[in-house]
Amino acid sequence: EICGPGIDIRNDYQQLKRLENCTVIEGYLHILLISKAEDYRSYRFPKLTVITEYLLLFRVAGLESLGDLFPNLTVIRGWKLFYNYALVIFEMTNLKDIGLYNLRNITRGAIRIEKNADLCYLSTVDWSLILDAVSNNYIVGNKPPKECGDLCPGTMEEKPMCEKTTINNEYNYRCWTTNRCQKMCPSTCGKRACTENNECCHPECLGSCSAPDNDTACVACRHYYYAGVCVPACPPNTYRFEGWRCVDRDFCANILSAESSDSEGFVIHDGECMQECPSGFIRNGSQSMYCIPCEGPCPKVCEEEKKTKTIDSVTSAQMLQGCTIFKGNLLINIRRGNNIASELENFMGLIEVVTGYVKIRHSHALVSLSFLKNLRLILGEEQLEGNYSFYVLDNQNLQQLWDWDHRNLTIKAGKMYFAFNPKLCVSEIYRMEEVTGTKGRQSKGDINTRNNGERASCESDVLHFTSTTTSKNRIIITWHRYRPPDYRDLISFTVYYKEAPFKNVTEYDGQDACGSNSWNMVDVDLPPNKDVEPGILLHGLKPWTQYAVYVKAVTLTMVENDHIRGAKSEILYIRTNASVPSIPLDVLSASNSSSQLIVKWNPPSLPNGNLSYYIVRWQRQPQDGYLYRHNYCSKDKIPIRKYADGTIDIEEVTENPKTEVCGGEKGPCCACPKTEAEKQAEKEEAEYRKVFENFLHNSIFVPRPE
């Protein structure tokens, strides 16, 4: 029986009965917030073999092992994850072992096992046999392994029953509990699963099977399940659903899920039955079950009940995220804010059409309107008094409307009004008239030539770069010395630069009047020698990175014909040289035979150029005789090993309080002070733990149902 669409068992342990007939949970399984310690021994769900999303256990008092509850849970598919995790075991106060001895595969996602004070048998499980990549697993804050003394079956009797694998250079027995080994398939099966008797399953099986080489005997399917058979792809007229099974069109048409209730129903796209058309596609008609590609960004119509939407904060802008057509009027009134330009672009950057008017007033935080980076049409179906559909009043720091070289904006109906925008040049407004097709609509007083641009350098000359030199982390540039009509007006230059992967940045990107600016700024004094060209060395740059650079002349606010003269350069794009890449990440090695090592790694976080190949070096090490000196199977005689990393147990410090130079050969020594990098890593780790815990609490604490 398939159970779904996600099962949440909380408060009352008897709700576990809901799992009685489930073989597959299509969705997640939450077992949480059961504060009264119960006896779970009478609860056993041997039918449950697959969870298609994730398993979350949180604060279940009295539960000591999962093995009795779910003895046959074989696969957690991770089709949807809980904060990147397919298995989360968090704050399980009484859990002593995981015990999921039939768990063979976590198809997607990692595991997070944290703050389980009594939990052992963690180091005896080889998660690499279950997951593709173990590097994202997070196993922290559980019972210290030293206090566990985990012993696999038969070890005490010196008749070990479990198989060995290598984890972190430690070759050891692998088990789930004191009497359950971790199952491993013969190497002859390769990536295939196997039966309890070690016979290889059909290639389409995942986890296990009841008979060898039979696609109808799989416990779970590697790809898709249809009519009792595991298939590599869904047959004709059936569609992939929830990442694991094939359904017909009728099933897909009839789905009414809590998650999709507001939508127009599920769609069939690219052989899959899904909740919505994927990114870049739209329904082929409002009630269609099929998707077609969007031309440009997919339309999303947003409507304001009160006709006029006031944007006075990031929060109000957030409501417009993803909107491409706004039915109504926009009133923008941003007086202050942090990182406002990029936040507004994030939430309003997709708007293409406004059906009413756009009014920008008292928005002293704005330097540019480029955050409306896709606005192409103002219909002006509703207009302000005086028939204005674009109204810009009293914006003390507004310097740019849009980059008119790369912008097509049409105002279909209505006039424009501009007043009291002291840094907005009238030439910029006139340019907008031409582009938008409103030229001739405005009357004389609609664009005030005296109080717009009165405090801006509106007649700009162009500065030209004369030379550029690059190294791996430096750029040297020089430019022509600017000579204003009166040389005393020139004070200095300001160089603006930033990383620019693409050649599409503008001067006003990410800039607002409250100090946020995506550009780095450096002041450059005039060279005392009038014949020397000004220049600068930009250092501390990243290797093999493209930067955008431009220069502005800083001039006295000399007014000439009512306007200030100024000068600035075009934006120059320049790439630093390549350099040595950082080290490859997550290097793991394991032996799969007596004469082979398998080494895996992830690419470096900073390639610093185009990677062409890796060099792998290895050398033989002498065997550590220390390993043979003790009987590790004897539970009481595990020696405390002295690691050569400078850290020791507190007990040992009290015995021998002498301090030695770190790294010395003379015995115990103090821990070396943490490096800045280590401190930073610890800080990030603590932050990450908090973020996860907040996510957990926000996800699971919900209002009580009626």
Epitope: E1, I2, C3, G4, P5, G6, I7, D8, R18, N21, C22, G27, F251, A253, N254, I255, L256, S257, A258, E259, S260, S261, E264, G265, S286, Q287, P705, E706
Partner: antibody, heavy 117, light 112 residues
Framework: QVQLQESGPGLVKPSETLSLTCTVS?????????WNWIRQPPGKGLEWIGY???????NYKPSLKDRVTISRDTSKNQFSLKLSSVTAADTAVYYC??????????WGQGTLVTVSS | DIVMTQSPLSLPVTPGEPASISCRSH???????????LQWYLQKPGQSPQLLIY???NRLYGVPDRFSGSGSGTDFTLKISRVEAEDVGVYYC?????????FGQGTKVEIK
């Protein structure tokens, strides 16, 4: 894989309240769909009574609205029908059924309720 | 309530012959979203109803192609191109476009 099972007394006295429960297995009633009651008097046609939705809102047949209540117990994954002031005309086979976005896809096997003194 | 009227109420048929059932509503059952939620169900003796056709003309996966649905607005028809013995039972039309949902009175199909 989704199963619905009606349960309740087979005999109810006139003027009393008829109470039936539908136990759902294989799907959480809060996860989606509309959970309906439909009845069929002996030898007659089907009559839709009403539903409770996955988020707990109700819709009833107007002519029964004053007498009918459909509620749910999410912890047991059950929904219930209560029909008050019953008469012989309420004698019928009562079905619970799941309705999706378009149609009824799963039905219980039905339970006969007789109203008689 | 929208009343769904079926005709005939009884339909004796010969195996291999075609059959047709009509269902009329006294007002349009087109939903505001443009869809017409008109279904046809078959109830075999002693069983719960089972779906045959949804949204006027969509045959449910697994239903034999001798069944077809058609119509629009207020007039709808279920056709069986060649009746087989297993097709006996009561056929109901049902509308789910507007609450309250309603069934037709049913058409009993039996073999002559």
């Amino acid at each position: 894989q989704v199963q619905l099972q009606e349960s309740g007394p087979g005999l109810v006295k006139p003027s009393e309240t008829l109470s039936l429960t539908c136990t759902v297995s294989g799907y959480s009633i809060t996860g989606g769909y509309l959970w309906n009651w439909i009845r069929q008097p002996p030898g007659k046609g089907l009559e839709w009574i009403g539903y409770i939705s996955y988020h707990g809102t109700n819709n009833y047949k107007p002519s029964l609205k004053d007498r009918v209540t459909i509620s749910r117990d999410t912890s047991k994954n059950q929904f219930s029908l209560k029909l008050s002031s019953v008469t012989a005309a309420d004698t019928a086979v009562y079905y619970c059924a799941r309705h999706g976005r378009v149609f009824f896809d799963y039905w219980g096997q039905g339970t006969l309720v007789t109203v008689s003194s | 309530d929208i009343v769904m009227t079926q005709s005939p109420l009884s339909l004796p048929v010969t195996p291999g012959e075609p059959a047709s059932i009509s269902c009329r509503s006294h007002q349009s059952i087109v939903h505001s979203n443009g869809n017409t939620y008109l279904q046809w169900y078959l109830q075999k003796p002693g069983q719960s109803p089972q779906l045959l056709i949804y949204k006027v003309s969509n045959r449910l996966y697994g239903v034999p192609d001798r069944f077809s649905g058609s119509g629009s607005g207020t007039d709808f028809t279920l056709k069986i191109s060649r009746v087989e013995a297993e097709d006996v039972g009561v056929y109901y039309c049902f509308h789910g476009s507007h609450v309250p949902w309603t069934f037709g009175q049913g058409t009993k199909v039996e073999i002559k």
